[in-house]
């Protein structure tokens, strides 16, 4: 058993049929010595008396808010949460496996630039009685500071018969140099509590590997005389690291109709303009990627051909 | 300890092409190592990230773009002294700081070159003959060093008398390649910045 925060404790349980469970001793936070009784949750049934209460925690029915009283007055609370371990593996029931970029990916993180700011998100089908707490650091043995905000519900989607909820959090490395060469990864730890179930999820990454620039901005078209060709130009996104001659991007320019199966024109360039063939009912799209370290491409920025 | 903005003429920077080749060569070699050594811990997640140039050169700090010198997190107090006559300096007005930067890059390349050559000598003794260093990568390191053209003491190639542990050598190769790729990215960024300045 360990303390998650003040008066909230996590009991780690091997979860299998007829498991013996864990013996837990609760101590009432009071100078009083006698006349103390214990109850669980809203029940008035007295579970025991005395300054300490020893319980055998085997299942969720044994978890909850234990309260010690004296003469009708509440002295202190202890909330017990369960963390299940099945076949040596901690449970991951609360969050959905996003399966990208690989199986057992529960947390996904992205950074728009090298400033040390990044966003992580996760998915769940649970809508109520759910809380998250996020911590992060650079490295684990001698951790350096990363400050994370509160996790917030950022999107709701309908997936078949189920509703899916996306939560996200923003973090910022306390002293980040955009030009630095990372040797220690960022560690992100998310504590998830659903009712009386506790789970924790972690992700480890280098900022350079989670870079995904914003789409290029200010796409403009200029038809070329006596030709089917069009010159398309754009600018670096405002959120990208500067100077741009140091943090350079490369671009993919594509002309395509509404369907992905339609024919297309595609060209890659390090410049902020390109010449392509425009077709009726097609769109010109441009996306960006770090020129020197191939992490993710940005989303497309698009303009219609006509 | 940073790069001034008014430096060489655009397009007159002979090292840009070599640095692009360097990044390409080390990336290809790393990809080849990951594929060939698939049953060894050779991915970014599996290896320890070591920097053989740590406390010996200060390329990131010496080559910091002017715009980032206002960022206190970028200003590390490490100082290293370097020799300062390089042929990539395409203008006589080039400052001492830029010479320091390019000299630091040269020292990085020299250190990695020695490590890679030593390692290749060991790998050539491996009866499995599983992986060797790409001669193209070694040639590209050499070309960039020649383009930088700094006079510097030659570092003797390390020779070891004991029987090489090929498993450890291959893991060290992965560690070196990952670190060298990251340094090659920095070098490419620096050359691009100087070329645009």
């Amino acid at each position: 058993i360990w303390e998650l925060k003040k008066d909230v404790y996590v009991v780690e349980l091997d979860w299998y049929p007829d498991a013996p469970g864990e013996m837990v001793v609760l101590t009432c936070d009071t100078p009083e010595e006698d006349g103390i009784t214990w109850t669980l949750d809203q029940s008035s049934e007295v579970l025991g008396s005395g300054k300490t209460l020893t319980i055998q925690v085997k299942e969720f029915g044994d978890a909850g808010q234990y309260t010690c009283h004296k003469g009708g007055e509440v002295l202190s609370h202890s909330l017990l949460l369960l963390h299940k371990k099945e076949d040596g593996i901690w449970s991951t029931d609360i969050l959905k496996d996003q399966k990208e970029p690989k199986n057992k990916t529960f947390l996904r993180c992205e950074a728009k630039n090298y400033s040390g700011r990044f966003t992580c998100w996760w998915l769940t089908t649970i809508s109520t009685d759910l809380t998250f707490s996020v911590k992060s650091s650079r490295g684990s043995s001698d951790p350096q500071g990363v400050t994370c905000g509160a996790a917030t519900l950022s999107a709701e989607r309908v997936r078949g018969d189920n509703k899916e909820y996306e939560y996200s959090v923003e973090c910022q490395e306390d002293s980040a140099c955009p030009a630095a060469e990372e040797s220690l990864p960022i560690e992100v730890m998310v504590d998830a509590v659903h009712k009386l179930k506790y789970e924790n999820y972690t992700s480890s990454f280098f900022i350079r590997d989670i870079i995904k620039p914003d789409p290029p901005k200010n796409l403009q078209l200029k038809p070329l005389k006596n030709s089917r060709q069009v010159e398309v130009s754009w600018e670096y996104p405002d959120t990208w690291s500067t100077p741009h001659s140091y943090f350079s991007l490369t671009f993919c320019v594509q002309v395509q109709g509404k369907s992905k199966r339609e024919k297309k024109d595609r060209v890659f360039t390090d410049k902020t303009s390109a010449t392509v063939i425009c077709r009726k009912n097609a769109s010109i799209s441009v996306r960006a990627q770090d020129r020197y370290y191939s992490s993710s491409w940005s989303e497309w920025a698009s303009v219609p051909c006509s | 300890r940073n790069l001034p903005v008014a430096t060489p003429d655009p397009g007159m920077f002979p090292c840009l092409h070599h640095s692009q080749n360097l990044l390409r060569a080390v990336s290809n070699m790393l990809q080849k190592a990951r594929q060939t050594l698939e049953f060894y811990p050779c991915t970014s997640e599996e290896i320890d990230h070591e920097d053989i140039t740590k406390d010996k050169t200060s390329t990131v700090e010496a080559c910091l773009p002017l715009e980032l010198t206002k960022n206190e997190s970028c200003l590390n107090s490490r100082e290293t002294s370097f020799i300062t006559n390089g042929s990539c300096l395409a203008s006589r007005k080039t400052s001492f700081m830029m010479a320091l930067c390019l000299s630091s890059i040269y020292e990085d390349l020299k250190m990695y070159q020695v490590e890679f050559k030593t390692m290749n000598a060991k790998l050539l003794m491996d009866p499995k003959r599983q992986i060797f260093l790409d001669q193209n990568m070694l040639a590209v390191i050499d070309e960039l060093m020649q383009a930088l053209n700094f006079n510097s003491e030659t570092v003797p190639q390390k020779s070891s008398l004991e029987e090489p542990d090929f498993y450890k050598t291959k893991i060290k190769l992965c560690i070196l390649l990952h670190a060298f790729r990251i340094r090659a990215v920095t070098i490419d960024r620096v050359m691009s910045y100087l070329n645009a300045s």
Epitope: R228, R261, V267, T269 | -
Partner: antibody, heavy 118, light 107 residues
């Protein structure tokens, strides 16, 4: 299985024209760009131009501009390349090639030898 | 027009040995570079597109690398069926242009 089948070999006199056909089978004809590339004996490949069969849009290499005409007939899934004012240096194998991507070629015809000789 | 220069023009190789063909562009073409194989009397066959992207059905011994002006086609271990002429082609701008070809022959 997508195939491009070209017309047979031709012998032409200098100053005349030649029209080579390329019939596509497998896949929808208008879903692909169609190009013509030639290869003189013992020489490399030379791109001549492309057509979008969907709308008839064409683009030609400056070297052939004014001398080459590429057309397409959607009803028969056939593309044509006509080269006029032939000279002996136009002796080559002319091949059609196609792709959903405009700028490179994933399927080629077998080629048509055009010999220009007086 | 962008001029594509291949080297060597002729490459004698022992079967089972690796082979590398170089292609250089007269100006930077990013990764807009494609490789073809042509055997005598046959149409060219696309091997690699956009410098390094492999084609399904093409053996994994063929790989491409490069960007900017310098590109390489590598055959890791030459098989008897690989003896042919190889062409690079740029698609950075029209007109599309090819290299002169590299003939890989048995040593």
């Amino acid at each position: 299985q997508v195939q491009l089948v070209q017309s047979g070999a031709e012998v032409k006199k200098p100053g005349s024209s030649v029209k080579v056909s390329c019939k596509a089978s497998g896949g929808t004809f208008s879903d692909y760009y169609l190009h013509w590339v030639r290869q003189a004996p013992g020489q490399g490949l030379e791109w001549m131009g492309w057509i979008d069969p969907e709308n008839g849009d064409t683009e030609y290499a400056p070297k052939f501009q004014g001398r080459v005409t590429i057309t397409a007939d959607e009803s028969t899934s056939t593309a044509y390349m006509e080269l006029s004012s032939l000279r002996s240096e136009d002796t080559a194998v002319y091949a059609c090639a196609r792709n959903k991507e405009l700028r490179y070629f994933d399927v080629w015809g077998q080629g048509t030898l055009v010999t220009v000789s007086s | 027009d962008i001029v594509m220069t291949q080297s060597p023009l002729s490459l004698p190789v022992t079967p089972g040995e690796p082979a590398s063909i170089s292609c250089r562009a007269s100006q930077s073409i990013s990764i807009n570079l494609h490789w073809y194989q042509q055997k005598p009397g046959q149409a060219p066959r696309l091997l690699i597109y956009f410098a390094s992207q492999s084609i399904s059905g093409v053996p994994s011994r063929f790989s491409g690398s490069g960007s900017g002006t310098d590109f390489t086609l590598t055959i890791s271990s030459l098989q008897p069926e690989d003896f042919a002429t190889y062409y690079c082609q740029q698609s950075n701008s029209f007109p599309l242009t090819f290299g002169q070809g590299t003939k890989v022959e048995i040593k």
